[in-house]
């Protein structure tokens, strides 16, 4: 999990569409029990907003201690505040849990800016608005941290949902979701619907607002419209995918597709922004500026620093372009595209101007660690993390913010050749991926 524009955050070669339809969600295949349908008890179980993360309520220990936990697909540790901290309303008190077991091992997780460290143990964990199961899971009890917890975010820990390869201190520490699948009959799949507000929320509204849904063990059809399109998980560490083409308002950026995935492309609910490799970011911003050239914005806006404000209700969405990312499909030489609106990549910021104004930050930023499809991308889509079949599905979210003229889209198939060449092969080193 990279800090900076990461949560805790810290707050990025298509062709003509085919005439024939290629398979996407293969409806004719037998379904696993519980894989499809309705998961009423899990719908609306997330709260928060893109700038400070989405969290789910969890209980830890015996008797159960309730905590709000950030949902992070960009890391693999379950870590919770376990000592007093000025930004925490509550924390995990191991001494009060009769089922806590100490692993007698420490863990230290540094970020580009900030860090957390703690003590490893295991305890009983459940998700009240999740599957009706309790699992014994590894827990990092955070005893010290710097620039990790966010004042007013309302979460006290982090649920790393990625794979063991990037777990700390090493890949022998089983991540929570692996423990859940091993110890129960929950299918090896989860799905996320993150619902961006589209307008600023004040503190009381955030606490009262619904942020979306984490469906554990399945797919809820009520959370999306249209079809689910799947892209392969390239490697099971982060949720790594391959982008094969990028368009701004339908105009191809025309870069070598390796640049889009340099040095990787990941789907990460714990990052606020769409983060793009330097060259791609520069080309994208140039293209977005050109598309919106009837108005000019300050340099600091494009750096994600200055906020641009419009009189409430007058944000000129129409001058900003749509952004399309083409992802490798499941079928040879087939891709599909996901398209986001300015309503996703202009992030509303609360508590800065008067109620007469709507103010926004540009939520696309530069990365030195590859493309990160963060909350601003995910807020447009229902995203299925199908670990069992090593693939990630995208469909248009039923809660995405749009206007009467444009909507987010997931479309395909498109013919795209040599997509394997778009992946970047990272040289193997012992260096920490978290420190880049």
């Amino acid at each position: 999990t990279q800090h900076g524009i990461r949560l805790p955050l810290r707050s990025g070669l298509g062709g003509a569409p085919l005439g024939l339809r290629l398979p996407r969600e293969t409806d004719e295949e037998p379904e696993e029990p519980g894989r499809r349908g309705s998961f009423v008890e899990m719908v609306d179980n997330l709260r928060g907003k893109s700038g400070q993360g989405y969290y789910v309520e969890m209980t830890v220990g015996s008797p159960p201690q309730t905590l709000n936990i950030l949902v992070d697909t960009g890391s693999s540790n379950f870590a919770v505040g376990a000592a007093p901290h000025p930004f925490l309303h509550r924390y995990y008190q191991r001494q009060l849990s009769s089922t806590y077991r100490d692993l007698r091992k420490g863990v230290y997780v540094p970020y580009t800016q900030g860090k957390w460290e703690g003590e490893l143990g295991t305890d009983l964990v459940s998700i009240p608005h999740g599957p009706n199961v309790t699992v014994r899971a590894n827990i990092a009890a955070i005893t010290e941290s710097d620039k990790f917890f966010i004042n007013g975010s309302n979460w006290e820990g982090i649920l790393g949902l990625a794979y063991a390869e990037i777990a700390r201190p090493d890949d022998s520490l089983e991540p929570f979701f692996d423990s859940l699948v091993k110890q129960t009959h929950v299918p090896n799949l989860f799905s996320l619907q993150l619902c961006g507000a589209g307008f600023p929320l004040n503190q009381s509204e955030v606490l009262a607002s619904v942020g979306g849904s984490m469906i554990i063990g399945g797919i809820d059809h009520s959370l999306y419209t249209g079809s689910l399109w799947y892209t392969p998980i390239r490697r099971e560490w982060y949720y790594e995918v391959i982008i094969v083409r990028v368009e701004i308002n339908g105009q191809d950026l025309k870069m070598d597709c390796k640049e889009y995935n340099y040095d990787k492309s990941i789907v990460d609910s714990g990052t606020t922004n769409l983060r793009l490799p330097k060259k791609v970011f520069e080309a994208a911003v140039k293209s977005i500026k050109a598309a919106s050239s009837t108005e000019k914005f300050p340099d600091g806006f494009w750096l994600g620093e200055q906020l641009v404000c419009w009189q409430a209700g007058t944000t000129p969405w129409n001058i900003f372009p749509v952004i399309s990312l083409y992802l490798m499909g499941e079928v040879t030489n087939q891709s599909f595209r996901i398209t986001i609106l300015p309503q996703q990549y202009l992030r509303p910021v609360e508590d800065v101007a008067t109620s007469q104004d709507d103010c926004y930050k540009f939520a696309i930023s530069q990365s030195s660690t590859g493309t990160v499809m963060g909350a601003v991308i995910m807020e447009g889509f229902y995203v299925v993390f199908d670990r069992a079949r090593k693939r990630i599905g995208f469909a248009v979210s039923a809660c995405h913010v749009h206007d009467e003229f444009r909507t987010a889209a997931v479309e395909g198939p498109f013919v795209t050749l040599d997509m394997e060449d778009c992946g970047y092969n990272i040289p193997q080193t012992d260096e920490s991926t978290l420190m880049t």
Epitope: K296, F297, G300, E305, Q306, L307, D357
Partner: antibody, heavy 120, light 108 residues
Framework: QLQLQESGPGLVKPSETLSLTCTVS??????????WGWIRQPPGKGLEWIGN???????YYNPSLKSRVTISVDTSKNQFSLKLSSVTAADTAVYYC????????????WGRGTLVTVSS | EIVLTQSPATLSLSPGERATLSCRAS??????LAWYQQKPGQAPRLLIY???NRATGIPARFSGSGSGTDFTLTISSLEPEDFAVYYC??????????FGGGTKVEIK
Amino acid sequence: QLQLQESGPGLVKPSETLSLTCTVSGGSISSSSYYWGWIRQPPGKGLEWIGNIYYSGSTYYNPSLKSRVTISVDTSKNQFSLKLSSVTAADTAVYYCARLGHGYSYFDLWGRGTLVTVSS
Amino acid sequence: EIVLTQSPATLSLSPGERATLSCRASQSVSSYLAWYQQKPGQAPRLLIYDASNRATGIPARFSGSGSGTDFTLTISSLEPEDFAVYYCQQVYLWPPRTFGGGTKVEIK
């Protein structure tokens, strides 16, 4: 070098419309590097931003004045203008036109200002 | 709304002395802050932008510092022509709309 000069009546009656023009000389108002703005200063008081305009005609106004303000641009004359309707004595001020440079963020060049008095 | 509070309202100093002017924002404006100088009967003049960068033609005795909510304009050794009113302005929110109330630097 580039200069800005405000012009317009120094006296306006209450409820009427204040109209000022800023003439840009020594450079083009159609430069893509700048916005152009109006700021006012009541006698003995501080500065108040009124609004900005880009040569394309894109405008931004102070929310507190928006219902009464219109800023327009005439690229052929290298001028931009301010109209403030339904004026009262509280609109008596020195009105400055200025260039918004340094990444469209700071007023780096100002006109000398013109005093407009609202009185019957 | 972001409010800029300047202090002191008036600063009485002699030529050659060091002047320290403060501007405090009601919430963080990062480093998007400017300082302007205004002499009687004249238009304001940009001195400092982005909190610490001197504008073109501004003497080295003027310097700006700070980020977030607390900013300082320092005049290392006052010249007679430096006696004026100084305003800060935030541009974290764009378009720039908020000026401080001003600090008058007068001859003691």
